[in-house]
């Protein structure tokens, strides 16, 4: 008991730290990031430094998570006209040479 | 193009609480990230807080931590800010601002309320 | 939090004649991946709220006219008006927008000599 009780603890713990809307991989099953909401604030390019899509089956929905200048991550719709945008728009970014 | 009305002048005691109004058009509120900056007479601009959408919540500065309230009613596109235990000091103009894409800055700004502490 | 400190806390420049205000980050607000530094220049008129002039330190937001032009990276940067007209007549503020929160200069007054 007073082991589950502290898993129980270190799990709140960790939950505090994970950013909204974003589930973090579950060590025992396979290593899955999930999105269970989405942000519907419009963010500028100016603050975002990349993305990953999130496409796995065992996931709910689709979805981008943007990782920003800060190194903060967020869920964004990939159906969502600004989120397209900010993805060409980094793709653009990285396929540039740096001079 | 974001437009921010700001309700009008208020004049309150010291300790009594305000609550300031804006109204946005041309957005929905949801879709943006509502900030709230002060600017006492003769002085410079202070931000207070706002929506910080990489964190998905509302942030306030450390210095009014406690004191203001920072709410939305999207039923109406209009943010609210509430800051409590007024004293002399808190007389200034109290502007809502914000972009339409968060940058960080401020490209859109209300016209101003202005907030008079006095016994 | 980041203090912005800028200098003078006010200048007399005649017309036609340039502006120089700068303004001092207490730590760099520059992100190496892409070079862009989070500073941005605002002018306030009296009576009204303020207007961004540039972001990215340099970078003019539109309908700002040329003679308003951003330099400077890391920690320290330069706003300068080339060419002083009686329409600048202002107080500055320089913002750094990389961290929250978001911390502003105490403003430059600019007058006509």
């Known amino acids: 008991m007073k082991v589950s009780a502290a898993l129980l603890c270190l799990l709140l713990i960790a939950a505090t730290f994970i950013p909204q809307g974003l589930a973090q991989p579950d060590a025992i099953n396979a290593p899955v990031t999930c999105c269970y909401n989405f942000t519907n604030r419009k963010i500028s390019v100016q603050r975002l430094a990349s993305y990953r899509r999130i496409t796995s089956s065992k996931c709910p929905k689709e979805a981008v998570i943007f990782k920003t200048i800060v190194a903060k991550e967020i869920c964004a719709d990939p159906k969502q006209k600004w989120v397209q945008d900010s993805m060409d728009h980094l793709d653009k970014q990285t396929q540039t040479p740096k001079t | 193009q974001v437009q921010l009305v700001q309700s009008g002048a208020e004049v309150k005691k010291p300790g009594a609480s305000v609550k300031v109004s804006c109204k946005v058009s041309g957005y929905t509120l949801t879709e943006l990230s509502m900030h709230w900056v002060r600017q006492a007479p003769g002085k410079g601009l202070e931000w207070m807080g706002g929506f910080d959408p990489e964190d998905g919540e509302t942030m306030y500065a450390q210095k009014f931590q406690g004191r203001v309230t920072m709410t939305e009613d999207t039923s109406t596109d209009t943010a609210y800010m509430e800051l409590s235990s007024l004293r002399s000091e808190d007389t200034a103009v109290y502007y809502c601002?914000?972009?339409?894409?968060?940058?960080?800055?401020?490209?859109?700004w209300g016209q101003g309320t202005l907030v008079t502490v006095s016994s | 939090d980041i203090v912005m400190t800028q200098s003078p806390d006010s200048l007399a420049v005649s017309l036609d004649e340039r502006a120089t205000i700068n303004c001092k980050s207490s730590q760099s607000v520059l992100y190496s991946p892409n070079q862009k530094n989070y500073l941005v220049w605002y002018q306030q008129k009296p009576g009204q709220p303020p207007k961004l002039l540039l972001y990215?330190?340099?970078i003019r937001e539109s309908g700002v006219p040329d003679r308003f032009s951003g330099s400077g990276s890391g920690t320290d940067f330069t706003l300068t008006i080339s060419s002083l007209q009686a329409e600048d007549v202002a107080v500055y503020y320089c913002q750094q927008s990389y961290f929250t929160p978001w911390t502003f200069g105490q403003g430059t007054k600019v007058e006509i000599k």
């Open positions: 990215w330190a340099s």
């Open positions: 601002a914000t972009d339409d894409f968060w940058s960080g800055y401020f490209d859109y």
